[in-house]
Amino acid sequence: MNGRVDYLVTEEEINLTRGPSGLGFNIVGGTDQQYVSNDSGIYVSRIKENGAAALDGRLQEGDKILSVNGQDLKNLLHQDAVDLFRNAGYAVSLRVQHRLQVQNGPIGHRGEGDPSGIPIFMVLVPVFALTMVAAWAFMRYRQQL
């Protein structure tokens, strides 16, 4: 039995300045090109090396772009989305959804083909242990005073 794959979803506003070779990324998606099942959203499929997005460092492949310069990307044809980016001007504001994969469920099992998500217990257990050690050390220190 495979562990359930969950995602931590965060949103971020990313302001890019168009470089000599443009914004420097590719997109997939749209109402006529659903790349993610049951989702016609626009996703980053590639970030060009040394392009504006790569040099900024925040935009990642797999990110969902929610808006460009305040304009919603919902229910757009793919080419309309492409044109929106191409005509967005010199300073471009992107509202982006990042998805960080975390995995819950049985230890040591991973869905076939799933990228290796970090099981959440592997993060929480060391953090808890460190907290306990720090609390114990603090109490010992106070007793000595």
């Epitope: 070779s21 443009g22 914004l23 420097g24 990324f25 590719n26 997109i27 997939v28 006529d32 090109q33 790349y35 980053v44 499929s45 590639r46 060009k48 090396e49 793919h78 080419q79 492409v82 980016f85 191409r86």
Partner: nanobody, 127 residues
Framework: DVQLVESGGGLVQAGGSLRLSCAAS????????MGWFRQAPGLERDFVAE????????GYADSVKGRFTISRDNAKNTVYLQMNSLKPQDTAVYYC?????????????????????WGQGTQVTVS
Amino acid sequence: DVQLVESGGGLVQAGGSLRLSCAASGRAFNTYTMGWFRQAPGLERDFVAEISWSGGSTGYADSVKGRFTISRDNAKNTVYLQMNSLKPQDTAVYYCAAVIGSPTDYSDYRSSLDYDYWGQGTQVTVS
């Protein structure tokens, strides 16, 4: 990932025509931007033509405009390059290239750095 195999190259006389094909295997072919590049001996790989995921948008190098036509058949996972009025200067190894998604940058010219997947090439010789 996508694998690309070119065919259709050969020896042709100046003024003649050839049609190159590029068969792609892999998932979601209709999300890939496809291109053709060429490389003559001792020279860099040069952009020839590009076609969008749906075939609705194309771009060409100035040297081939009006003579070459790029097209694609998403049902057959194949992209084509129809080459007419061939010149000796068109002699080169022709490469099919693919990249996932559509560039958000408008450009009449693409560099090889804009593509991630390449075929092995097919030789075109114009005498």
